[in-house]
């Protein structure tokens, strides 16, 4: 009998989308509506995830796979499998406990999520600020002040030739 293909476990023949029904001699039964089994041989079906409230359905639940959620406009996913939705802020802002707040001077955020990050300190790399930073954009670092001295060439020298045997794969 197909049901008993495996002498060790008669449930092993139950395909994804079904469960091994303990109520009737371990016969494979289809998962009820709004439940699923993503692998064969399962003894129960898992309840489908419901995308409610701030969550919306990205992929419907089927008998073999769970529903997948994303977030309604104005929110973005956090966590594995979009386990949470977090409010979007504007660029130049970050989300705090009191809501969206502008980035402090010297910090920026170029996305609708995440925190404000400090502007790059150009001088740490021996460079100067070419374009000032804003709440939405980082500073743009330019050549070091020494490179801008009179007579200094602003032409970028050619890249050195690669050594033999080290060409890109």
């Amino acid at each position: 009998f197909e049901r008993t293909r495996s002498l060790q476990d008669p449930c092993s023949n139950c395909p994804a989308g079904t469960f091994c029904d303990n109520n009737r001699n371990q016969i494979c039964s289809p998962c009820p509506p709004n439940s699923f089994s993503s692998a064969g041989g399962q003894r129960t079906c898992d309840i489908c995830r419901q995308c409610k409230g701030v969550f919306r359905t990205r992929k419907e639940c089927s008998s073999t796979s769970n529903a997948e959620c994303d977030c309604t406009p104005g929110f973005h996913c956090l966590g594995a499998g979009c386990s949470m939705c977090e409010q979007d802020c504007k660029q130049g802002q970050e989300l705090t406990k009191k809501g969206c707040k502008d980035c402090c001077f010297g910090t920026f955020n170029d996305q609708k999520r995440g925190i404000c990050r400090p502007w790059t300190n150009c001088s740490l790399d021996g460079k100067s600020v070419l374009v000032n930073g804003t709440k939405e954009r980082d500073v743009v670092c330019g050549p070091s002040p020494a490179d801008l001295s009179p007579g200094a060439s602003s032409v970028t020298p050619p890249a050195p030739a690669r050594e033999p045997g080290h060409s890109p794969q």
């Epitope: 009998f1 197909e2 049901r3 023949n13 139950c14 395909p15 994804a16 989308g17 079904t18 109520n23 009737r24 001699n25 016969i27 494979c28 039964s29 289809p30 998962c31 009820p32 509506p33 709004n34 439940s35 089927s62 008998s63």
Partner: antibody, heavy 123, light 108 residues
Framework: QVQLQESGPGLVKPSETLSLTCTVS????????WSWIRQPPGKGLEWIGR???????NYNPSLKSRVTMSVDTSKNQFSLKLSSVTAADTAVYYC?????????????????WGQGTTVTVSS | EIVMTQSPATLSLSPGERATLSCRAS???????LSWFQQKPGQAPRLLIY???TRATGIPARFSGSGSGTDFTLTISSLQPEDFAVYYC?????????FGQGTKVEIK
């Protein structure tokens, strides 16, 4: 609501293979088992076997060596093949939706049947 | 396999009378998986009762089912002209699914 319609040749020669198709309309073939049942003239009902939408099958041991079932989810159809037929295979053949559970795990029996198709085995 | 035995083979009754049909299983069957079907000449079987006692959609209240274990009963409280047909019990508790041989309810 779900409806089933059997189709296939009404006459099959002895030793040949009987082939029938059941088309599911008004709903998806997915997520259910689907059964074939037959009824010889003037006799009772005999369960032939069932198939899940993934192609997993269970057959009646009395017919297992001659039965093959398949499913085509893209066409919402499932099929029966019965090989090496004899006059004893002359019957009305029905397809039906196999038993299933609702969300509260109440079990429903074979609740939807096709109207049946008569197959005669004769030379 | 589970053998389902129905009795009597034929029941001759008049309209308005009560019909009691018996179904016995060769081994215990969970009542959740016991169904009754009605079949009229030239028609497909129609599910009447599932879970031994629950009427299917659209089935009149004069049909009732009862029983557990190995003994099950279908009762038609007051036969109507359209009720004269063949009735089958069926189990899908264990493979292979099996039907009783049927009880014919005929007009006396």
């Amino acid at each position: 609501q779900v409806q089933l319609q059997e189709s296939g040749p009404g006459l099959v020669k002895p030793s040949e293979t009987l082939s029938l198709t059941c088309t599911v309309s008004g709903g998806s073939i997915s997520s259910y088992y689907w059964s074939w049942i037959r009824q010889p003239p003037g006799k009772g009902l005999e369960w032939i076997g069932r198939i899940y939408t993934s192609g997993s099958t269970n057959y009646n041991p009395s017919l297992k060596s001659r039965v093959t079932m398949s499913v085509d989810t893209s066409k919402n159809q499932f099929s029966l093949k019965l090989s090496s037929v004899t006059a004893a295979d002359t019957a009305v053949y029905y397809c039906a939706r196999d038993g299933w559970y609702d969300e509260d795990y109440n079990y429903y029996g074979m609740d939807v049947w096709g109207q049946g198709t008569t197959v005669t085995v004769s030379s | 396999e589970i053998v389902m035995t129905q009795s009597p083979a034929t029941l001759s009754l008049s309209p308005g009378e009560r019909a009691t049909l018996s179904c016995r299983a060769s081994q215990s069957v969970s009542s959740n998986y016991l169904s009754w079907f009605q079949q009229k000449p030239g028609q497909a079987p129609r599910l009447l009762i599932y879970g031994a006692s629950t009427r299917a959609t659209g089935i009149p209240a004069r049909f009732s089912g009862s029983g557990s274990g190995t003994d099950f009963t279908l009762t038609i409280s007051s036969l109507q002209p359209e009720d004269f047909a063949v009735y089958y019990c069926q189990q899908d508790y264990d493979l292979p699914w099996t039907f009783g041989q049927g009880t014919k309810v005929e007009i006396k």
